[in-house]
């Protein structure tokens, strides 16, 4: 696994702890809580980075609806079980033994259960609608400008291959990023968007995940583009499976 | 040369605490992982923990959680492990050993927990 | 945890035999096991890290293959002092475990 070589320490993940002991003496580092060997050369998977804090069409300019399928993460923090790989298991439990399914992004898309519930496979989260509000500012941005910069910084921030980033909807004061990621269309090597938008809303929220790096300064046209609220919906390949009872409460 | 010398043996009685130290040289001590590692009596080898001596960061095996405690004094280079609430089943030769693959090791300190 | 199965628990060799050693995780753990010797009233030794990664000082017989699950440990030709308890470790992730051992006896 790579790091820097010279001080060996993991630019892209300040939640590890890096020795010389790698495989043919290379710097190895190691996340928090799980004790898994991570690639300091690309994002640290979600599964890996919660273990470790616990331990609409391209070119529309109108905003998203959410489809009534679009889950959010309202659980909040929990210590997940990862897979070999640094992966969500499908299936998550608590220390009381309440049991539920989960996405790739980890978040809940099923009641809650006992330990006989069932989570057949890991359901992929392909598309992620990232949803801010920005402070006021003197007038609106300039929606081209506000798009290249967005798809810069997912691309040399975080990484994410730009034909991911599916569209950048603007309408003062509100900002719509739409990240796409197909099971097909994900090759070996990309990184996830579920790990991406999860390194981004750290940012947001002045919690850098990165090794050294300042915050996140975010600037459109020299304008400081500061975010105010930050909401998230999660859509998976296949429905979550909710009982009426919570789709009506 | 790498070298980690350990204190020598202890005796102690049921439910009293015991604290072993490992003394490295010959490397950077505050870089490499020091782990502590069991062997009771014609058994096989038992992972205690790990301790990253630059930040202090200990992770334990679940079994040793509430009664180890591992430390390290990187001004004199030593690692510590102490475990409380001794059981006659703790009588073991205690090990540490360095970084993830277990490199060098120290001689051992035979623990005796009799009453 | 990770648990890693040893196989076989006594292993029966006459001096210049090769000896074959396995080593099987519960999970993937790619190429994190080593291999350690040890013998009476002594500490172990590492022979072999990261599945075939061979140790300075360790004589050349001893080779190390495997990832996955499924890891071997290989003395090609048995010296009399080769006979001891041959253990696998992880470091895939926390907490680190140990094989069981397998003995190494003389035939």
């Known amino acids: 696994h790579t790091a820097a070589q010279d001080n060996c320490t993991c630019p892209t993940n300040k939640m590890t702890v890096c020795s010389p002991d790698g495989p043919g003496g290379r710097c190895q580092c190691r996340a928090l809580g799980s004790g898994m060997a991570v690639d300091c050369s690309t994002l640290t998977s979600k599964c890996l980075l919660l273990k470790a804090r616990m331990s609409a069409p391209k070119n529309a300019r109108t905003l998203v609806r959410p489809s009534e399928h679009a889950l959010v993460d309202n659980d909040g923090l929990y210590d997940p079980d990862c897979d070999p790989e640094g992966r969500f298991k499908a299936r998550q439990c608590n220390q009381t033994s309440v049991c539920w399914c989960v996405n790739s992004v980890g978040v809940r898309r099923t009641d809650k259960g006992d330990l006989s519930l069932r989570c057949d496979e890991l359901v992929r989260t392909h598309h992620i609608l990232i949803d801010l509000r920005h402070r006021p500012t003197a007038g609106a941005f300039n929606h081209s400008d506000l798009d290249a910069e967005l798809r810069r910084l997912f691309r040399e921030r975080y990484r994410l291959h730009p034909k991911f980033v599916a569209a950048v909807h603007y309408e003062q004061p509100t900002i719509q990023i739409e990240l796409r990621q197909n099971t097909s269309q994900k090759a070996a090597g990309d990184v996830d968007i579920g790990d991406a938008a999860y390194y981004f809303e750290r940012d947001i929220k002045g919690e850098s995940l990165f090794q050294g790096r300042g915050g996140l300064d975010l600037r459109v046209r020299g304008e400081p583009l500061q975010v105010e609220r930050t909401l998230i919906y999660y859509l998976d390949e296949i429905p979550p499976k909710f009982s009426m009872k919570r789709l009506t409460a | 040369q790498v070298q980690l010398v350990q204190s020598g043996a202890e005796v102690k009685k049921p439910g009293a605490s015991v604290k072993v130290s490992c003394k490295a040289s010959?490397?950077?001590?505050?870089?490499?992982?020091i782990h502590w590692v069991r062997q009771a009596p014609g058994q096989g080898l038992e992972w205690i923990g790990t301790?990253?001596?630059?930040?202090?960061?200990?992770v334990y095996n679940q079994k040793f959680r509430d009664r180890a405690t591992m430390t390290a004094d990187t001004s004199i280079s030593t690692a510590y492990i102490e475990l409380s609430r001794l059981r006659s089943d703790d009588t073991a030769v205690y090990y540490c050993?360095?970084?993830?693959?277990?490199?060098?090791w120290g001689q051992g300190t035979t623990v005796t927990v009799s009453s | 945890e990770i648990v890693l199965t040893q196989s076989p628990a006594t292993l029966s060799l006459s001096p210049g035999e090769r000896a074959t050693l396995s080593c099987r995780a519960s999970?993937?753990?790619?190429?994190?096991i080593h291999w350690f010797q040890q013998k009476p009233g002594g500490a172990p030794r590492l022979l072999i890290k990261y599945a075939s990664e061979s140790i300075s000082g360790i004589p050349s017989r001893f080779s190390g293959s495997g990832s996955g699950t499924d890891f071997t440990l290989t003395i090609s030709s048995l010296e009399p002092e080769d006979f001891a308890v041959y253990y696998c470790q992880h470091s895939h992730s926390w907490p680190f475990t140990f094989g069981q051992g397998t003995k190494l006896e003389i035939k």
């Open positions: 999970q993937n753990i790619g190429t994190s």
């Open positions: 050993a360095r970084a993830s693959y277990f490199d060098y």
């Open positions: 010959g490397y950077s001590f505050t870089t490499h992982w």
């Open positions: 301790i990253f001596p630059s930040n202090a960061y200990a």
